[in-house]
Structure formats: structure tokens, C-alpha cells
Amino acid sequence: MAVTACQGLGFVVSLIGIAGIIAATCMDQWSTQDLYNNPVTAVFNYQGLWRSCVRESSGFTECRGYFTLLGLPAMLQAVRALMIVGIVLGAIGLLVSIFALKCIRIGSMEDSAKANMTLTSGIMFIVSGLCAIAGVSVFANMLVTNFWMSTANMYTGMGGMVQTVQTRYTFGAALFVGWVAGGLTLIGGVMMCIACRGLAPEETNYKAVSYHASGHSVAYKPGGFKASTGFGSNTKNKKIYDGGARTEDEVQSYPSKHDYV
């Protein structure tokens, strides 16, 4: 039960995280015009990974796409790449994890296969989350660098006679969405990996140990032996932990094949 819950929760958290990564990637507000200690302009500028927008005081908004590939900063291209890789890995991870879910039966899929798929999706979610966090962090670092550069020469002009308003940009909403989403995907991935450990079938070694007593030959086969670690050589298809306190008799009992839906 606990394994199913962990796996299910990991899937849901990852799903929310990947939806957030997609949303952040598509959002226009990666960087927004800094309004603090600046002349109050009648226009508000903000930029995304794919286009920049200007909102006038009247509400009129105009967005222009970056219709060049080579003319864009390498850092922006890197951020785009990281976010896209994160989305692709996350999407594949979601696809894999759907089939790996313990609550879904697909033919006669072995638990070992489900465990492997859960681990694979978990790793994909972790990498996806890391890609998103890295992408957002690279962009944030770029913003901070540019912010202080533009602060240094807030007003540039010809002998101080004509002043140019330097538009400074600060963190936009997409950065926070990206960080949170990346974190959720990462957490979801970790949960999937944890669930995988619980799904992994235990291999039982039936090694007979013979004790030769005087006049008798008795072979003791430790069929009901349980490994103290919880991950040792248990009986086939045995669930390690179900999250609830149970009697020793319950622990000893074997699950039927119908316990796995």
C-alpha cells in the first residue's frame, strides 16, 4: 500500500512539476522591467524565452517574437535548450511512469519490469527537474549580471546633457514558476526512485542446510525466514512495507497473486 501511495504521489507531483516547467517555458515574464528607483514610464517591458512584450498604460500589449536564432545570446539559447530537454525528459518520464504504476495492470507485466520502469521514470524526473532548475538559475544569473551592469551606467548621455533611460530588468514570475516546478519534478522523481525499491521483487535462495544428528538426518529449510534488513532474501513477490503496524502473523503471510492490481 505504501509503495503504491509513494509511487502515485511521485507521479502526481512530477506531473504538476512538468506542467509547471512547460508553463514557465511558455511564459513571457522571465524578466520584467524594474520599477524600483527608476523613472516612472508609461510603458512596461517584459521578456520571455521566445518573445519580448511591451504593455502600455492603456492596457495595449504588443509582443514581438525573437525571429532570429543566430542573433540571440548564447546564454538564452542554453536556457531554451535546458528547458526543452527538461520538458522532453519529463514527458517521456510521465509516459513511462504511467505504465509503471502499480495500480494499473498491463497484461502480465512482471513487478520487476514495473520496478525498472519506475526507476527509469524517477531518474528522468530528477534530470528533468535539474534541467529546469539549471535553466532558470542560468537566466537569473544573467539577469543579475545585466542588472548591475545597467545600474552602473543608469543614465548614459552626451556630456550629461541628453539622458537615456536605461531599462533594467528584474526577476519575472516565470523564474519562480520554473524553480518551484523544477523542485516538484525533482521531488517526484525521488519519490519514484524510493517506490522502485519497494517494488523490486525479492529473490529467495532456497539453500538447504543439513544438520547431521546422531541416528537422524534432518534437513532444515528456512522457508519462513525473513531478512532483518527488509531488503534481504524474502519470498517471491513479497511487499516489504505497507505502512501500517501489523502483527507478526500478518508479516509472515504470503500475498496471493491477486494482491497486485
Epitope: 522591467q33 523613472p39 516612472v40 514610464t41 508609461a42 510603458v43 517591458n45 517584459y46 521578456q47 519580448s52 512584450c53 511591451v54 502600455e56 498604460s57 492603456s58 492596457g59 495595449f60 504588443e62 514581438r64 541628453v162 539622458q163 537615456t164 533611460v165 531599462t167
Partner: antibody, heavy 118, light 113 residues
Framework: QVQLKQSGPGLVQPSQSLSITCTVS????????VHWVRQSPGKGLEWLGV???????DYNAAFISRLSINKDNSKSQVFFKMNSLQPNDTAIYYC????????????WGQGTTLTVSS | DIVMTQSPSSLTVTAGEKVTMSCKSS????????????LTWYQQKPGQPPKLLIY???TRESGVPDRFTGSGSGTDFTLTISSVQAEDLAVYYC?????????FGAGTKLELK
């Protein structure tokens, strides 16, 4: 067609307040902002403030302490009030519609001529 | 506040003549986000409120004759009337629409010779 009609007093005594109502037709105040501008022989055209479609306002810092702009969308009316008037506030006061783009004023009221005198 | 300086203060012209008037701002009116200049030109005839002619420094308002042309960028702007007509006699104002408070120039008065 778009129209802005102003109503207000022509003569106000010093230290009194000025109230002008700008009644609009041909458009809705829920979609457009309304600016207020005055024109005096000494200072030319001066922007005073604006009330945006959402009800938020921006004022000229020089008038912020004695100026208030409000509106009633249902009545299509914008209310302008300026306190503590002095003779140098004598001017023609205009309301003007904020154009949807360009941050400019595309339609103007006929103007309210104000004289501040005792 | 941004200071808008218009020159000349008055122009005496003959009908059919080409006219140019200048407007300079103390700060750049160019917005880097959309590469648009937030400068507007108005025409005001005696006893009337100002009328919008040109916004974004060079975009003509609908219904404005194409003899009116706005140009310039940053801090220097020009309004050109390719062939002055009698009905063009008025005062022309430029306005900063970029930084609050929005400010106007003192105007250029166009008079007939």
C-alpha cells in the same frame, strides 16, 4: 461617435475647489482611460492626471496633493476635483480619452474655462 | 520632468510650401522593448481643443492627411508638412508620452504670409 462633454463652473474664488464632470459617449469607461490636461497662457499645456479603465490613477507630482480623479462607469462620468485654487490656476481644463495605443489622447472634451478670482 | 523644446516658436509660410518644425526632448523617448518613440504631435486651431495628428513619433492617426509626416528618434523629432494648406494654420504641439509626468512642448505657431 466618440464625445466628451464637460460641465463645471467658470469662476471660482481663491482657496476654493474646482469640480468638473466629464460625461462620455460613444465608448465605455471600462475600456478606456481619461486624462485631464489644462492650458494656460503662461504655462501652455500641462498634464494633470489620468484615471485608467481599471480605476487606478496617475497624477502629476506637482498636483498630487490637491487633485483627485474618480469615475462612475455606469453613468459614463469622470469626476475631476482640484482643491486650494489660486489665480495661477486660471486655465482651460480639458478631459481627453486615452488612446488604446501610443499613450496619447485621441479625443478631447470642449474644455472648461476657469477663472480664479475674488 | 522631461523638458520638450520646440523650434521655431512661429513660422510664416505660403500655401503649398514645405514646412518642418523641430521638437527636442531632454531625455530619450525611445523604448528599448519595442523600439518605439513615445512622442506625439497635436494640432490646435483657435478656440478648439488639440487634435491628435501623429503618435509613436511617425504613425499617422486615421483621418490625418498624408502631407503630415513625423520622423526622428531618441531625443530629436521633426514634423513635416509637405504642402501647407490654409486649414493647416494652427499651433503644433509635441508631447512626451513616455515618462511621467507627461509633458508638452510650448508649441510652434504656423501663420500664413
Amino acid at each position: 461617435q466618440v464625445q466628451l462633454k464637460q460641465s463645471g463652473p467658470g469662476l471660482v474664488q481663491p482657496s476654493q475647489s474646482l469640480s468638473i464632470t466629464c460625461t462620455v459617449s460613444g465608448f465605455s469607461l471600462t475600456y478606456y482611460g481619461v486624462h485631464w490636461v489644462r492650458q494656460s497662457p503662461g504655462k501652455g499645456l500641462e498634464w494633470l492626471g489620468v484615471i485608467w479603465r481599471g480605476g487606478n490613477t496617475d497624477y502629476n507630482a506637482a498636483f498630487i496633493s490637491r487633485l483627485s480623479i474618480n469615475k462612475d462607469n455606469s453613468k459614463s462620468q469622470v469626476f475631476f476635483k482640484m482643491n486650494s485654487l489660486q489665480p495661477n490656476d486660471t486655465a482651460i481644463y480639458y478631459c481627453a480619452r486615452a488612446a488604446y495605443y501610443g499613450n496619447c489622447f485621441d479625443y478631447w472634451g470642449q474644455g472648461t474655462t476657469l477663472t480664479v478670482s475674488s | 520632468d522631461i523638458v520638450m523644446t520646440q523650434s521655431p516658436s512661429s513660422l510664416t509660410v505660403t500655401a503649398g510650401e514645405k514646412v518642418t518644425m523641430s521638437c527636442k526632448s531632454s531625455q530619450s523617448l525611445l523604448n528599448s522593448g519595442n523600439q518605439k518613440n513615445y512622442l506625439t504631435w497635436y494640432q490646435q486651431k483657435p478656440g478648439q481643443p488639440p487634435k491628435l495628428l501623429i503618435y509613436w513619433a511617425s504613425t499617422r492617426e486615421s483621418g490625418v492627411p498624408d502631407r503630415f509626416t513625423g520622423s526622428g528618434s531618441g531625443t530629436d523629432f521633426t514634423l513635416t508638412i509637405s504642402s501647407v494648406q490654409a486649414e493647416d494654420l494652427a499651433v503644433y504641439y509635441c508631447q512626451n508620452n513616455y515618462i511621467y509626468p507627461l509633458t508638452f512642448g510650448a508649441g510652434t505657431k504656423l501663420e500664413l504670409k
